[in-house]
Structures are given as structure tokens and as C-alpha cells.
């Protein structure tokens, strides 16, 4: 067995993709790996090449399919392996049984838009993006508002904790520059994780029309 | 915390199937990542499959080359280890084991990251 100092860990975007990264200490960085996917319960498999990312791990992306697709179920098991080349043979380098629904990264939210924008407010929509029907109304989202002179790790955290695609920002200051970011994540799943944030959206609020206390 | 007890082990010819069962009693099963040792005379423990609190993701020694599958079952305080297409260099004497600190299921744990253990059930894979 791999040692400690390996990791192998992979996530499932809940239609057609399991993303893995896999890493080991003092690995060549020129070593050709791969990432194998058989299901228990489907006719297919697949494949994709571990490219690295840092100086000792590797990552790919196991496409199952058009991305929209429903390729995985809650009740499915897929069998990861990590392969090497040594020479003129594939050496197995990990094993792992993966339950796609108990391990959700979903795709980050996408077309991010500003549907009304006041001087003190701003409504702001979205959407999900290659997210299962199974979920239904099961997820939630947190959403970032970047005010001038501050960063995003400062910025307090929004939670909705339902399936609400839009958003009313209040208590903005007038004729003020902000940048705004929303992340999904399932309520199921042992290893479920936030999605990354979505593109920032940048918006303007109106200015205060002038002898008007607003 | 949990006792633990192996049964289903005994003896089996090359090619041939076994299910090892390993029963918990006394504490929250569910709280517990379990895992698969086994030694053979004169040799170390060895690592053969741990998986997580919910078993979301389970970790298998290569020696296995995916024969072996383990699963558990919280609802009846019961992580199995499935042994298919077994072959003599499977003879040994197979332990369960739980550990009460979190495991992600991303690499192969040691021996050591077990705190509890059970007595232990031999398989013997006759040629």
C-alpha cells in the first residue's frame, strides 16, 4: 500500500464528472499516472490522465459523459484506481470504492445577473449549473458581497439555506462599486463540499439624487 | 465505547468466496471509521480496507487487486469484508478494527490509527 504521506481524493459534480487529485510525497513529477472509473452497476468505464498541479500532486477529470447527462446514482459504487507507469507496465498505486452521491462538489454558479439595482439595494439572480434533478429543492447556497477596501475573506457570509436563485442586497451605500459571489452545495453526502464560487459579478449602486434624503 | 467481534472465517479453497462479518456493541457504530487488518504467521499486520463513518469512500490495499469489498451497515452495527476469488496468500487471521478520530478516506491509515480491536477470525485458503 501507498503510504501516509499519499492522498486520493475525488468529487462528483452530480451529473457527468468526477474530478480527482491525487498526490504523494516524493512522487517524480514526470511519472505518466492515470485515474481508472468502473462502476458496480453500469456497462461502462473510463479513464483520464493525471496531469500535475503543484510539485507533488496530480489532477484530471473523469468526463462520463454529455455534461448534462445523469451518468451516476445515490445507489452506485465506483471503483477508482490509481495507475503508474514503471517500464512497460501499469502499477496500481490506490484503490478506492466511491459513492458519487456521498461526495457532491457541484459546478459553480453561473449567469449571474442584476436585475434591479436602487441606490441602498440590488436584486441579484443565478443559476445552477450540471446539478442533478435528484436534488429537487434540496440545496443550499452562501453568497459574498466585495465592498471597497475590503477583501473577499472579509466579507461576511450570506446563507440561504434553501433553493433560492436570487438574492436582495440591502443597506448599500449610493454610487458605490461592489462585487458580488454566490456557491452551491447539496444537503446530502458524507463528504459533500461547497462548489467554487461563481465568476464575481460587479455592479454599481445608484447614486443619491441630489437635495433627497435617501 | 464499542466491543467488537469477527465471525464468518474458516476454511476455503483458492477461487473461492467468504464473508467476514464484524458485529459492534456498546457505543455509536456510526461515530466509528472501521477497518480490515490481517496478519499471517511470521509476518506484520497488514492493512487490508478501511472505510468512512458513513462509507462514503473506502480505502483498499493494492494486495487485493479489487477482489475483496467491505461495506457497512449502520443500522445493524456491521462492517462486512466480501473475499472473492481468494488465493492461499490469503491465509491469515483477520481483524477488525474501529477508530474514534475522523478518517476522509483518502489514504491508507495505519495500524496504529486504530484504537480498538477485535479478537480476530482465521481464513485459510487451501490450493
Known amino acids: 500500500a501507498v503510504n501516509g504521506t499519499s492522498q486520493f481524493t475525488c468529487f462528483y459534480n452530480s451529473r457527468a464528472n468526477i474530478s480527482c487529485v491525487w498526490s504523494q510525497d516524493g512522487a517524480l513529477q514526470d511519472t505518466s499516472c492515470q485515474v481508472h472509473a468502473w462502476p458496480d452497476r453500469r456497462r461502462w468505464n473510463q479513464t483520464c490522465e493525471l496531469l500535475p498541479v503543484s510539485q507533488a500532486s496530480w489532477a484530471c477529470n473523469l468526463i462520463l459523459g454529455a455534461p448534462d447527462s445523469q451518468k451516476l446514482t445515490t445507489v452506485d459504487i465506483v471503483t477508482l484506481r490509481v495507475l503508474c507507469r514503471e517500464g512497460v507496465r501499469w502499477r496500481v498505486m490506490a484503490i478506492q470504492d466511491f459513492k458519487p452521491f456521498e461526495n457532491l462538489r457541484l459546478m459553480a454558479p453561473i449567469s449571474l445577473q442584476v436585475v434591479h439595482v436602487e441606490t441602498h439595494r440590488c436584486n441579484i439572480s443565478w443559476e445552477i449549473s450540471q446539478a442533478s434533478h435528484y436534488f429537487e429543492r434540496h440545496l443550499e447556497f452562501e453568497a459574498r458581497t466585495l465592498s471597497p477596501g475590503h477583501t473577499w475573506e472579509e466579507a461576511p457570509l450570506l446563507t440561504l439555506k434553501q433553493k433560492q436563485e436570487w438574492i436582495c442586497l440591502e443597506t448599500l451605500t449610493p454610487d458605490t462599486q461592489y462585487e458580488f459571489q454566490v456557491r452551491v452545495k447539496p444537503l446530502q453526502g458524507e463528504f459533500t463540499t461547497w462548489s467554487p464560487w461563481s465568476q464575481p459579478l460587479a455592479f454599481r449602486t445608484k447614486p443619491a439624487a441630489l437635495g433627497k434624503d435617501t | 465505547e464499542v466491543q467488537l467481534v469477527e465471525s464468518g472465517g474458516g476454511l476455503v479453497q483458492a477461487g473461492g468466496s467468504l464473508r467476514l462479518s464484524c458485529a459492534a456493541s456498546?457505543?455509536?457504530?456510526?461515530?466509528?471509521?472501521m477497518g480490515w487488518f490481517r496478519q499471517a504467521p511470521g509476518k506484520e499486520r497488514e492493512f487490508v480496507a478501511a472505510?468512512?463513518?458513513?462509507?462514503?469512500?473506502?480505502m483498499y490495499a493494492v494486495s487485493t487487486e479489487g477482489r475483496f469489498t467491505c461495506s457497512r451497515d449502520n443500522a445493524k452495527n456491521t462492517v462486512y469484508l466480501l473475499m472473492n476469488r481468494v488465493k492461499p496468500e490469503d491465509t491469515a487471521v483477520y481483524y477488525c478494527?474501529?477508530?474514534?478520530?475522523?478518517?476522509?478516506?483518502?489514504?491508507?491509515?495505519?495500524?496504529?490509527?486504530?484504537?480498538?480491536w477485535g479478537q480476530g477470525t482465521q481464513v485459510t485458503v487451501s490450493s
Open positions: 456498546g457505543g455509536t457504530f456510526s461515530s466509528y471509521a
Open positions: 478494527a474501529a477508530r474514534t478520530s475522523y478518517y476522509s478516506g483518502t489514504y491508507y491509515p495505519a495500524s496504529s490509527d486504530f484504537d480498538i
Open positions: 472505510t468512512t463513518r458513513g462509507g462514503g469512500r473506502t
